[in-house]
């Protein structure tokens, strides 16, 4: 069972230094700052699920050296930045979508001995990402169609 933590009750101030090992910003309608790093040097698990995020500003994650789990479920991601994908020890939780192709490719090319990457469908069922991309994102299919998996229920 994955660890969990409750979300901060106040509005998020990105200048705050967060000391916790777990941060829950799920379902807050957040927009991540483009040129500012999250200050959370202890965080192991960061939950950004259900925030309508399309982009993941690479600077935002730059100083999270201890991060192990990044929960991005229920966000309509258009792409995953290569620098983030290249963090081989980062466990990314995301919805099945063709936007994860870059993540898969970077991991395949840069990370050896990895367990199979997974993605989640709208019923919270796990899929092998490689198999999903092969079936749903083959050349000729519209990008990010993902066989309906890009529709998210919060």
């Amino acid at each position: 069972q994955e660890p969990s933590c409750t979300m901060p009750s106040t509005d998020v101030d990105w200048n705050t230094e967060f000391s916790a090992t777990c941060l829950n910003f799920s379902g807050r309608g957040l927009s991540l700052p483009l040129n500012q790093s999250l200050r959370a040097s202890n965080v192991l698990l960061l939950d950004l699920s259900g925030n309508g995020l399309r982009e993941l500003p690479v600077t935002f994650f730059a100083h999270l050296q201890k991060l192990e789990v990044l929960n991005l479920l229920h966000n309509p991601l258009s792409r995953v930045d290569g620098a983030l994908a290249a963090r081989c020890d980062l466990d990314l939780r995301a919805d099945c979508s063709c936007a994860l192709e870059s993540w898969h490719e970077v991991r395949r090319d840069n990370c050896s001995g990895q367990k199979p990457l997974l993605c989640w469908d709208t019923t919270s069922f796990q899929h092998n990402l490689s198999a999903f991309l092969e079936v749903s994102c083959a050349p000729g299919l519209a990008p990010a169609t993902g066989s309906g998996h890009h529709h998210h229920h919060h």
Partner: antibody, heavy 125, light 107 residues
Amino acid sequence: QVTLKESGPGTVQPSQTLSLTCSFSGFSLSTSGMGVSWIRQSSGKGLEWLAHIYWDDDKRYNPSLKSRLTISKDTSSNQVFLRITSVDTADTATYYCARRPRDFYGGGHWYFDVWGAGTTVTVSS
Amino acid sequence: DVVMTQTPKSMSMSVGERVTLNCKASENVGTYVSWYQQKPEQSPKLLIYGASNRYTGVPDRFTGSGSATDFTLTISSMQAEDLADYHCGQSYNFPLTFGAGTKLELK
């Protein structure tokens, strides 16, 4: 098999510096997510966390003792060290080192899965 | 610092009885709580992590539950080898902190 073993001087005089060594085997402290903490226990008392060192040499200290503590590691020889300066009788305790593992099949947890047997330190003149 | 308060300080139980140990955090720590068993003259051993995950090799009579501020370790049917001190600890925030322990004795 993962093992940790603490060693220390046994007795140290007040105001002196206490140096402790944790020798471990069965894992590498260069593995991402891995870390080792020092924790102590005074006679009949609870556990007190002192310091932690990460695989990337980042360190964390208990603020109540921070000015007196230094944690370090030698990855190649599989050892972690703790120095406590200006000791007094309140530092008399059993000192443990313990491993914080990285669980690649459900990350984000923090716990100590393996502890050393402990080394007893008495501060006395 | 997060204060972890364990109750009771000690308890005497008979073999086969159900044992419930409590741990209360002074602030919300999510599920970042572990339970450790410490037998006399031994070092602590991990029983439960993440509030409810049983560590490898731990008998299934040990169960952890709770979240936020209230946590429980239950031994469904106490065995003689369970006589020990039990410590809860939180790892949600630094400094990491532990409770004072509960001593489980034989009635």
